[in-house]
Structure formats: structure tokens, C-alpha cells
């Protein structure tokens, strides 16, 4: 079952080349989701971004850049605990059909060795829509800084929709958030991948409604085990 991805509200273009592990998952030429390069063969994204086949854009902040690498991928592995009903365990590994060429513009993301605490400033990035509910898709990668929010504070907003492997981030009284097209993309804190864009309130950018992310630090064992198993 396919689902459309998500984009960045109230952000700005990322500093060029500052996110060399950021990828776009395309369906044909159309943006489907974001993702991150874990190593030369693997991309990590959200489970709700599942498709039969992917075209992976790497190595350029600009979608459609002819200098970018485009690699097909036809194998993907959802977390076995992913639920389309509760949206828990919303992560998936996509295996590239051929290896990515690492360079200054194509680098592996650092997986976390610990879970960062509430209050930590992080950056979320993506090519998702910059407007909502009507969409405006940028060609350049967008970034916005947000802060991690405690589960207790986030539960006040989302109540029983929030599960313990979900991570919330936002800025009080601000529109800064991810949106359609950003799904599966990275939330990076202190140089490590802490979250993958999972879901949030629509229309996007409603003040005091945090973005919800898959908390990557809870899944490093599954990520490493899955890549080993399907080498």
C-alpha cells in the first residue's frame, strides 16, 4: 500500500552540500519521499514511503540536477513491527541496485550512539512542500531548525497517537515543521541522525503542533542487523 510522502514549512534553502547524506526517493521523476544514505548500498527512510520500485536521487541539493547520481532500487525492507494503523516503527531500509559513489556531496549519515534529550536543537531537511494545504514543491533542498520536545509535552497535543518510539520536534508558537514530501527524511541533531519524518498535523505548520519522527536511536540494532542479513 503506497502513501504519499511529506515538505518543509517556514524553512530556508540548506547551505549547499551541508546534507550530503540526504536523498530523495522518486517515483519516476516525481518526489515521493526523503531518505538518508546509511552506506554505499543502503538508504534509510520511512516505512509509509513503501513502493515497488524507487529511483534514488543523491549528490545534489537540486532535484533534476544532471550531475546528481540516480540509482534504481527494487528491494526494500520495512521494520517488521510497522503498523499502518498506529504508525509505530515507521522505518524502512531500501537496498540500492548498484553502489552509490561517495564524494564530498555523497556521504554516509552518522547513526546515533545515544538518544538526544529534549531541548536539543536539530535540523530537518527535505524537498517537501513549502506551503500547505496547497502545495509548492521547491527544487532546492530546504532546511529548518527545530528543538526536541519531551514525550510528556508532545502527548498533550497528540494524546494516544503517540508511541514510545516516536520523537517530537518543533518550535513553540512557530510554523517551522516538515510537510508533504518530507516523509522519511532526516532530523539531525549534533551531527547524528535522530529522527525520520513520520507524520504531523495537516495543514502543516500549525503553531504548537510538533512534527513527529521515528526515533532512530531506538532502532540502530535493527538497522545494522537488517543490512547484514540482506547483504
Amino acid at each position: 500500500e503506497e502513501a504519499q510522502g511529506d515538505k518543509i514549512i517556514d524553512g530556508a534553502p540548506c547551505a549547499r552540500g551541508s546534507h550530503p547524506w540526504q536523498v530523495a526517493l522518486l517515483s519516476g521523476n516525481q518526489l515521493h519521499c526523503g531518505g538518508v544514505l546509511v552506506n554505499e548500498r543502503w538508504v534509510l527512510t520511512a516505512a509509509h514511503c513503501k513502493m515497488n520500485e524507487y529511483t534514488v536521487h543523491l549528490g545534489s541539493d537540486t532535484l533534476g540536477d544532471r550531475r546528481a547520481q540516480r540509482i534504481k532500487a527494487s528491494k526494500s525492507f520495512r521494520h517488521p513491527g510497522y503498523s499502518t494503523q498506529t504508525h509505530v516503527n515507521d522505518l524502512m531500509l531500501v537496498k540500492l541496485n548498484s553502489q552509490a559513489r561517495l564524494s564530498s556531496m555523497v556521504k554516509k549519515v552518522r547513526l546515533p550512539s545515544r538518544c538526544e534529550p529534549p531541548g536539543t536543537t536539530c535540523t530537518v531537511s527535505g524537498w517537501g512542500t513549502t506551503t500547505s494545504p496547497d502545495v509548492t514543491f521547491p527544487s532546492d533542498l530546504m532546511c529548518v531548525d527545530v528543538k526536541l520536545i519531551s514525550p510528556q509535552d508532545c502527548t498533550k497535543v497528540y494524546k494516544d497517537l503517540l508511541e514510545n518510539s516516536m520523537l517530537c520536534a518543533g518550535i513553540p508558537d512557530s510554523k517551522k515543521n516538515a510537510c508533504n514530501g518530507d516523509s522519511g527524511g532526516p532530523l539531525v541533531c549534533r551531527g547524528t541522525l535522530q529522527g525520520l519524518v513520520s507524520w504531523g498535523t495537516f495543514p502543516c505548520g500549525q503553531p504548537n503542533d510538533p512534527g513527529v519522527y521515528t526515533q532512530v536511536c531506538k532502532f540502530t540494532k535493527w538497522i545494522n542487523d537488517t543490512m547484514k542479513k540482506h547483504r
Epitope: 494545504p133 504531523g200 498535523t201
Partner: antibody
């Protein structure tokens, strides 16, 4: 202003397939985050949700009708369609197309949406 | 499937009356409830979503409240244009979207 308009035959024979199209004007199906759905209302009765589709083609059907329903989208024509097979007199109803406004984006989007814009409806009678 | 039960099925009222319609869900739907108004021969029109959020362009005399399993639609001062049938709809479950049976508001 967004408008939806249903079209299709008003009379269908039993056991045949009912086919309806909804044309969207004043906005583009392919450049939005909305869902597009079909609801029906038998004469003198209440409303029944048939199913919905996202612009990317993800479909969600009422389990009671799932085996007979197909909803598809044609973004180039800004239309979405309903096909209901093996119809009987019980399928006689006014059929409405509507836009579904999601409450969330991303993983949670397709479970929480309400119908905020409706077409005028088209009457379909199943009779030989 | 989640069943939605509306009461009363018919309500007789006069212009200026305060009118309350109740909708009960067979299980908790949090605040995922919408209210629609339908006039004879016309399509339903969205009034309220997320239990209490007023749709743009809808008069402020309409209000919604409730959460969990019990919800109400209130018309603070009934106007001639408000005589119609009202439906609640739950959209907060993994089962299909379901509507209540309707409440017809008629002139007393």
C-alpha cells in the same frame, strides 16, 4: 473555488457495472494533499461511504463493498472515477463525489479525513 | 465497524430556539467527528470538523462539542435557513468512515 461534478449513466441494468466520473475544477488533483472519495445515499436513507483515493493512487474502500469497488484517478484530466460491479436494486442511490481533507500528513494521513467539498450528486437507478 | 447513533431522529423547533443534536459512537473516536447539514435534493455541507472546529463560512450559531463517544451539535438560535437534516460522521478509526442515521429538524 473548488467544484466537483459527477457524471455517468442514470440507469444501469442489474449485474452490470456502474461507472461514474467526478471532474474537479478550480483546483488540481495532482497538486494537493487531499483525498477524493465517493459517498452514496439510497432514496430516503442515510449516507454511506464507498471509498477514497489519494492523488498518488492509494485506495481505501469500505469493506462491505470492497469486492465490487474500484476507484481510480486520472490526474491528466483532473478526474477520479468509481466502478461498482455486479449491481443490484440495492445499489440505487444518489452518488456524491467529495474531497477528503486530512487531519495529518505522512504516515497518519489516510485514517483521519473528513469530506469538506461535495459534488451536487447524480442519481443512479438499477433496473432492467 | 464503528456505529454512530444520532438522537433524536426528528426534532420539531421554532425560529429562535436553541437546538441540540446528540451523536454517540459505539467506541471512542477521540475528537474525530464531523457534522453535516443536508437540505432536500442537495449535497451535504460540512459544518463542523474535529468535533468543535467551525468550517470556514459557517455561521457562528453552530457549535460542536464532545470527545470519546458522546458529541453534540448546537444551534444557538435557530434560523429559517437551518431547517434541514443533520448528519454526524466519524473519521477516527481504521474501520470505514461511518455516518449517523440523521436528525431532521422541522418547523414546529
Amino acid at each position: 473555488q473548488l467544484q466537483l461534478q459527477e457524471s455517468g449513466p442514470g440507469l444501469v441494468k442489474p449485474s452490470e457495472t456502474l461507472s461514474l466520473t467526478c471532474t474537479v475544477s478550480g483546483g488540481s488533483i495532482s497538486s494537493s494533499s487531499y483525498y477524493w472519495g465517493w459517498i452514496r445515499q439510497p432514496p430516503g436513507k442515510g449516507l454511506e461511504w464507498i471509498g477514497s483515493i489519494s492523488y498518488s493512487g492509494s485506495t481505501y474502500y469500505n469493506p462491505s463493498l470492497k469486492s465490487r469497488v474500484t476507484i481510480s484517478v486520472d490526474t491528466s484530466k483532473n478526474q477520479f472515477s468509481l466502478k461498482l460491479s455486479s449491481v443490484t436494486a440495492a445499489d440505487t442511490a444518489v452518488y456524491y463525489c467529495a474531497r477528503g481533507a486530512p487531519t495529518y500528513f505522512g504516515a497518519a494521513s489516510h485514517y483521519y479525513y473528513y469530506m469538506d467539498v461535495w459534488g451536487k450528486g447524480t442519481t443512479v437507478t438499477v433496473s432492467s | 465497524d464503528i456505529q454512530m447513533t444520532q438522537s433524536p431522529s426528528t426534532l420539531s423547533a421554532s425560529v429562535g430556539d436553541r437546538v441540540t443534536i446528540t451523536c454517540r459512537a459505539s467506541q471512542s473516536i477521540s475528537s474525530w467527528l464531523a457534522w453535516y447539514q443536508q437540505k432536500p435534493g442537495k449535497a451535504p455541507k460540512l459544518l463542523i470538523y474535529k468535533a468543535s472546529s467551525l468550517e470556514s463560512g459557517v455561521p457562528s450559531r453552530f457549535s460542536g462539542s464532545g470527545s470519546g463517544t458522546e458529541f453534540t451539535l448546537t444551534i444557538s438560535s435557530l434560523q429559517p435557513d437551518d431547517f434541514a437534516t443533520y448528519y454526524c460522521e466519524q473519521y477516527g478509526s481504521y474501520s470505514p468512515l461511518t455516518f449517523g442515521g440523521g436528525t431532521k429538524v422541522e418547523i414546529k
